[in-house]
Amino acid sequence: DTEIKVNPPQDFEIVDPGYLGYLYLQWQPPLSLDHFKECTVEYELKYRNIGSETWKTIITKNLHYKDGFDLNKGIEAKIHTLLPWQCTNGSEVQSSWAETTYWISPQGIPETKVQDMDCVYYNWQYLLCSWKPGIGVLLDTNYNLFYWYEGLDHALQCVDYIKADGQNIGCRFPYLEASDYKDFYICVNGSSENKPIRSSYFTFQLQNIVKPLPPVYLTFTRESSCEIKLKWSIPLGPIPARCFDYEIEIREDDTTLVTATVENETYTLKTTNETRQLCFVVRSKVNIYCSDDGIWSEWSDKQCWEGEDLSKKTLLR
């Protein structure tokens, strides 16, 4: 009774197509698969950024797999062949592992890479990234930003840099068609006559860095003798009403401060007849139904009612 063995896949490699972190893992079938012609061979692929605690594991029948990685670190991957039990009249057979690594050879001391990179997708319409130059770099150092997301043929360079003292310190992006809900990859590299500059890689999803415009058209309506309804409208732009959370800050007679978080464009406030002044402001943020994270908008303009019977008047700013 001969033991069934299978070879690992051949030519296992990680290929960088120049997409700033979106890499291809590819391989060829193992040698001597002739005995298993009737079998569908599977492959178990494990991969991770070097330094990560956990491996991602994929089982596939294909000869390739694609995923995003952090190119600030190296990547390690391993793969083996799986023969299902149907092929072996018994238990599943696994080959030994084939292993490979990939990294971008760095240049420059880490301090030379950009500092405090910050990207905001204003009102789900305009992406703006800003950074500070690396520590100790001279004014002849210039940084260049490249970006890619699925749908672009190749990585693109920023065409509208924000400058300070002749140095690029940010990028205003053009309209980014069909760019949300997918990984957005950025590389900021640099050059200097004086010394080599370390590149930095960043990955995020645009819907998670949205900063909306503040709400508009704040109004008061007396609902009853002890209730006032506060209302406002969503700001202009592409963000639908269902995507907003709001935070309200209400000040009564310059003393009581009420803060509340609500999911729609109204809030009912209990008041007393003695209330002489009422002011409120609202800000908005994309909610968990539309993103994993977000940035609060600026506060709206303040809307106040002062010294008049709210039952007789509705204020509209």
Epitope: G51, G74, W103, S105, Q107, I109, P110, G136, K195, P196
Partner: antibody, heavy 116, light 108 residues
Framework: EVKLEESGPGLVAPSQSLSIACTVS????????IHWVRQPPGKNLEWLGV???????NYNSALMSRLSIIKDNSKSQVFLKMNSLQTVDTAMYYC??????????WGQGTTLTVSS | DIVLTQTPAIMSASLGERVTMTCTAS???????LHWYQQKPGSSPKLWIY???NLASGVPLRFSGSGSGTSYSLTISSMEAEDAATYYC?????????FGAGTKLELK
């Protein structure tokens, strides 16, 4: 197996120049940077400089005017060149491989004595 | 330059004893770029702990590292004879790259 091996003149007269070679095997100089570090007898380690995989260099500013690091990828060799040597340059000189911002392999070192 | 101050300069420990040595930086260093090397007499340094807390290949699990900002430490949970050596901390964050003056650990 990764190996780095330094070779130098051993003894150099003051005010002279020196060249120390670091010959590597088991990896490619097109994928890893090489650092130079020295250690005077019984003293601290001092970083001299690095030549990156792409060929660019960084030097310790305190020694920059006297230092130069070059390499020959095809021969797997890196050279540290240093001029105007003084007795304070007497030290063990090491080359070390850069791997993800640390020195993961070191050579055994070569002793340099600056003396008349 | 970032100055790394190691304390104590020399220490001795008995077999099985817990050992801790510290490395204080003159300005903040990212934990990704703070490493420890072990050196024995007549040998070149060896990478021992990288990025503050990751053990290099072949380093016994009794070693550990921790810290952030300007304060870092290396700990041996139970001293063994082969641990007697000098340990250097090293910052790779800013140029020039610098090393501490070392902590010499002797067997009592």
């Amino acid at each position: 197996e990764v190996k780095l091996e330094e070779s130098g003149p051993g003894l150099v007269a003051p005010s002279q120049s020196l060249s120390i070679a670091c010959t590597v095997s088991g990896f490619s100089l097109t994928r890893h940077g090489i650092h130079w570090v020295r250690q005077p007898p019984g003293k601290n380690l001092e970083w001299l400089g690095v030549i990156w995989a792409g060929g660019s260099t960084n030097y310790n500013s305190a020694l920059m005017s006297r230092l130069s690091i070059i390499k020959d990828n095809s021969k797997s060799q890196v050279f540290l060149k240093m001029n105007s040597l003084q007795t304070v340059d007497t030290a063990m000189y090491y080359c070390a491989r850069d791997h993800f911002d640390s020195f993961d392999y070191w050579g055994q070192g070569t002793t340099l004595t600056v003396s008349s | 330059d970032i100055v790394l101050t190691q304390t104590p300069a020399i220490m001795s420990a008995s077999l099985g004893e817990r050992v801790t040595m510290t490395c204080t930086a003159s300005s903040s260093v990212s934990s990704s770029y703070l490493h420890w090397y072990q050196q024995k007499p007549g040998s070149s340094p060896k990478l021992w702990i990288y990025s503050t807390s990751n053990l290099a290949s072949g380093v016994p699990l009794r070693f550990s590292g921790s810290g952030s900002g300007t304060s870092y430490s290396l700990t041996i949970s139970s001293m063994e004879a082969e641990d007697a050596a000098t340990y250097y901390c090293h910052q790779y964050h800013r140029s020039p790259l610098t090393f501490g003056a070392g902590t010499k650990l002797e067997l009592k």
